[in-house]
Structure formats: structure tokens, C-alpha cells
């Protein structure tokens, strides 16, 4: 902490300028008004500070604000928000989308997912959902942040906003986000042809059951190995050969590539040798020629 | 010692259909599906479409699709291409190659000697 | 359907010479490229897979390079049995798709 001295007469500030990049740390923390400081935020961008002197505006107004900024402040805060942790934002309720837009710019280049993540937690909670606004900002500024979201925020996205939602903005979700997303992404293109519905639904697959995966296989989609690949462990068990065969098309070439990554090398462990020979790929490991299979977890649940 | 040997020049008139064959050896033929690519004189080449060895499955480049068909004999572990409807811009040397799974959908490795099939009336 | 654009379509070097080939593809293939030398008459033989693993047995004055859209094919000192026409081909997609070709003759 910044020890407290009291502050000269020639030295006092009366308002937010260029001249406090010529005073020390201890000046600062003893001539600047945390009040006035808050009031005059938007003019703090403009001025070079230190690091080392941002550390003594921020220490001004944690102090004044102990609950959390306003978001009158935090608006403003720009290269401020740099010194921001997880745990300062968890303060914060921001509903403004400029708010939003002002901040993820400044932390566009730096290191600060973390931040990001609790701010755009704290903009959905203020907000109430994440509804089309929120997300085409997030889209247009900070491409794959929609993933950062915790599947319990991204459960208030009404379906009617999925539409909004691009590829690129899925690639960093994770299985159980993805679980969320997919209902709703079902849901919202469920009036599509096929091959519409397809290149619209493809992105959310990683959350697609087994039944949804079997029934894209009755309609000629030629699913990408990619895309195949993303699918749920749990949802690609369950197929079989021909299934597979007729849900990828041409794609299928691919498996051989694949042979030793999950889900394929899961999937080949449970089809019989004899199937896996007709993909015509030289794939090894399935079940040999001949050979019973029991499923013992129906025996436990029975029992 | 991977071969791949294919049937000798065609001469056709339009209209006529054209069957050439590939003839694998040195290698598991069910294991790898076989492609074929063409070339017309002084053009580049042109990927036409491959097929599963092991259940006779075909996949065929849009542009052949009504044309072309793809068809295997596993017990003399031979391809065949036949291309119908001929007309004189399907001159052009045909061949069988088959892929090495080493990335993705596989870069094709080894290549037959070509089959040069002229139409022309 | 990935369309690859070769380029040029030929040129004429002299022996020593550094010979460079552009593929630009009409969308993102990775790294999933490979290069073809085709002489008069013969099939074509695969020199470059995957961007830039040379085959066993090639020369190591050829080279490649790149990812996503833009490829290069390079030969660092053009020798006389280097006179040949060289295609690219990507193979991100099951339906290949080869570069239009490129003619490298001898000044």
C-alpha cells in the first residue's frame, strides 16, 4: 500500500490533467480526490500514467468504491481496466453494451481471458440473458468469447438468437457447453431443408445424441472429418459401419488417419473386424471374426 | 514392390462408352481406395472420382457423375473406370493412383502407367 | 468444391537458378498440399507432401512451404532434369483437386 503523506499546496489537483504524470506515487495518493477522480474518469485514457502510477488510481477507487465500481466508472476506465482482477470485476454490474465494446478493446493483445470471462459474466447477469445484442457484440469483438461462458449463463441464450452465432465464435466451447447450445441451435433451424439445416446445425454437433447422429446419417449430409471428430464420445459409439459409412460420404477416406484418435479408435474397438473390412481402409482392432460379445453393465443393472 | 498396371490406348467414336482397367499388386488392395485422374492433351490434371475396394462404393467429381462408373474386381484385385457418352474433349491419358494415409484424405503415391484413350470420329 | 490457383503457368529459368511456384487455395486446407513433377509422357511423381516433407529420395534443392490458403513450391538451383511441368494438389477434402500446372523450361 501507498503510505499516507499529506499533500502540498502547490502540489493539490483540482482537476484530472496532464500535469499528474509529472507527480510521484505519493503524491498521487495524497493529492488526487478519489471523488473527483471518479468524476473526471473519461479523461484518464488521455493521459500516459505509468503502471505504476494506474496501481495508485486504482488503490483511489477501490477505496471509494469498496462494493464495486459504478458503471459510470467503468465505462471509462480503459488501460485502468488492465490492473482489473477476476475477483474486482466480480463486483461490477454492467449492463451497457458500450461498456462492454470500450473494455474488450483494451484488452484486445493482453493477456486477460480471465477478466474477459468474469466481465462478460457480469454484463449477462446484468443484462438478464444473453440476448442478440450481447451476443452479436461479442462476435464482432471478441471472436470465440462466447465459449467463456460458464453453461449455466449460456443456458439464458433464447434459441431465437443462435442464428446470430457463427462458427468461429464455437471453436474454444468445450462438450458441456456445446450440450447446452445444441437444443437450442435444433431448435432455432428446425424449419430448414437438410442440407440448409446441416451447414447451420454443423457447428453445434459436439452436443448432438447418438439418435440426432443417426438420423443426419438417413440424409446424405457428407459430414466433415472435423466435424466428425468434435462429436460427442458417447454419441459416436453407438453407430455402426454403415452408419458411419453414410453419414460421412467421401469423408469417410479420412478414418484411416484417424484410426488412433479418440472417437475413432473408441468406435473401432466396438465393431466387428468383418464391417470395419468393407470401409475398404486396412482399419485394425475391431472385434475378431467369430467372437460373442457380452454387455455386462446389463447383467449389473439387472442384478 | 506396390504396382499398378493399367489397359492399353482406346481409340472410340462418339457416343461410344470407354472401360479401362487398373490391376493392383504389392499391396493389400482392400486397403486403400483407388483413384483416377485424367488428362487431356497439353491440360493439367483432373481428379474424377475413387472407389472402396473392399465393397465396390464409388464417389465421383460432379462433373463425371452421369458419365462415369466405377467398378471393382476383388478377385483379381482390378479397378475399372468406364466413362459412356464419349466426345472428342475426353481424349486425354487416364489414370488409376492410389492414396497414402499419412494427413488427412491422403496424397496419392503411386500412379499408373496411363491409359491413353483418343475419340475421334 | 476447393479450387487451387497455380501460378505462373510457365517460365523459363536457367541452370542455377531459384525457381519459385505460388497455389493459392480458395479456402483454408491446412497444411494438406502436395507437389508433382510430370515429365512428357510419364505419370506424375510426387516430390512434397504435406506442405514440406520431402519425399525419400528427392533432391533436397526442393522445398515447400506455407499453410492455410498460400503455398509455395520451391527449387533452390534449377538443374537440367528439372525441366518438367509441377502441379500441386490439396488433399484437405476427399474430392481433390489439383493446380492448374506450371511449365519450367530451360533458358
Known amino acids: 500500500d501507498v503510505e499516507r503523506t499529506t499533500c502540498p499546496p502547490e502540489k493539490e489537483v483540482h482537476e484530472i490533467d496532464e500535469s499528474l504524470i509529472f507527480y510521484k506515487k505519493r503524491e498521487l495518493e495524497a493529492c488526487v480526490d478519489a471523488a473527483l477522480l471518479a468524476a473526471q474518469m473519461d479523461r484518464v485514457d488521455a493521459i500516459p500514467f505509468t503502471y505504476e502510477q494506474l496501481d495508485v488510481l486504482k488503490h483511489k477507487l477501490d477505496e471509494l468504491y469498496p462494493q464495486g465500481y459504478p458503471e459510470s466508472v467503468i465505462r471509462h476506465l480503459g488501460h485502468l481496466f488492465l490492473k482489473m482482477s477476476p475477483e474486482d470485476i466480480r463486483k461490477w454490474n454492467v449492463t451497457s453494451l458500450e461498456t462492454l465494446k470500450a473494455l474488450l478493446k483494451v484488452s484486445k493483445g493482453h493477456e486477460m481471458s480471465a477478466q474477459v470471462a468474469t466481465l462478460i459474466d457480469r454484463v449477462v447477469v446484468g443484462r438478464g440473458q444473453l440476448d442478440k445484442d450481447t451476443v452479436d457484440t461479442l462476435t464482432a469483438f471478441c471472436p470465440g468469447c462466447l465459449c467463456s461462458l460458464s453453461p449455466e449463463r449460456l443456458s439464458s441464450v433464447p434459441p431465437s438468437v443462435i442464428g446470430a452465432v457463427r462458427p468461429q465464435d464455437l471453436d474454444t466451447c468445450g462438450p458441456r457447453q456445446l450440450d447446452v447450445l445444441y437444443p437450442k441451435a435444433r431448435l432455432a433451424f428446425q424449419n430448414m431443408s437438410g442440407s440448409e439445416y446441416f451447414v447451420k446445425i454443423r457447428p453445434f454437433l459436439g452436443g448432438a445424441p447418438t439418435e440426432d447422429v443417426k438420423a443426419l446419417s438417413q440424409q446424405n449430409v457428407s459430414m466433415d472429418l472435423a466435424t466428425f471428430m468434435k462429436l460427442r464420445r458417447e454419441a459416436v459409439l453407438p453407430l455402426t459401419v454403415a452408419e458411419v459409412q453414410k453419414l460421412l460420404g467421401p469423408h469417410v477416406e479420412g478414418l484411416k488417419v484417424e484410426e488412433q484418435h479418440s472417437p475413432v479408435r473408441d468406435w473401432i474397438l466396438k465393431q466387428r473386424q468383418d464391417d470395419l473390412d468393407t470401409l475398404g481402409l486396412g482399419l485394425q482392432g475391431g472385434i475378431p471374426n467369430g467372437y460373442l460379445i457380452l454387455d455386462l453393465s446389463v447383467r449389473e443393472a439387472l442384478s | 514392390e506396390v504396382q499398378l498396371v493399367q489397359s492399353g490406348a482406346e481409340v472410340k467414336k462418339p457416343g461410344a462408352s470407354v472401360k479401362v482397367s487398373c490391376k493392383a499388386s504389392?499391396?493389400?488392395?482392400?486397403?486403400?481406395?483407388m483413384h483416377w485422374v485424367r488428362q487431356a492433351p497439353g491440360q493439367g490434371l483432373e481428379w474424377m472420382g475413387n472407389?472402396?475396394?473392399?465393397?465396390?462404393?464409388?464417389y465421383y467429381n460432379e462433373r463425371f457423375r452421369s458419365r462415369v462408373t466405377m467398378t471393382v474386381d476383388k478377385s483379381t484385385s482390378t479397378v475399372y473406370m468406364e466413362l459412356s457418352s464419349l466426345r472428342s474433349e475426353d481424349t486425354a491419358v487416364y489414370y488409376c493412383?492410389?492414396?497414402?494415409?499419412?494427413?488427412?484424405?491422403?496424397?496419392?503415391?503411386?500412379w499408373g502407367q496411363g491409359t491413353t484413350v483418343t475419340v475421334s470420329s | 468444391d476447393i479450387q487451387m490457383t497455380q501460378s505462373p503457368s510457365s517460365l523459363s529459368a536457367s541452370v542455377g537458378d531459384r525457381v519459385t511456384i505460388t497455389c493459392k487455395a480458395s479456402?483454408?486446407?491446412?497444411?494438406?498440399i502436395a507437389w508433382y513433377q510430370q515429365k512428357p509422357g510419364k505419370a506424375p511423381k510426387l516430390l512434397i507432401h504435406?506442405?514440406?516433407e520431402l519425399q525419400p529420395g528427392v533432391p533436397s534443392r526442393f522445398s515447400g512451404s506455407g499453410s492455410g490458403t498460400d503455398f509455395t513450391f520451391t527449387i533452390s538451383s534449377l538443374q537440367p532434369e528439372d525441366i518438367a511441368t509441377y502441379y500441386c494438389?490439396?488433399?484437405?477434402?476427399?474430392?481433390?483437386?489439383f493446380g492448374g500446372g506450371t511449365k519450367v523450361e530451360i533458358k
Open positions: 493412383a492410389r492414396p497414402y494415409y499419412g494427413s488427412s484424405y491422403g496424397y496419392f503415391d503411386y
Open positions: 504389392g499391396y493389400t488392395f482392400t486397403n486403400y481406395w
Open positions: 472407389i472402396n475396394p473392399s465393397n465396390g462404393g464409388p
Open positions: 479456402q483454408d486446407i491446412n497444411k494438406y
Open positions: 504435406y506442405t514440406s
Open positions: 494438389l490439396q488433399y484437405a477434402n476427399p474430392l481433390r483437386t
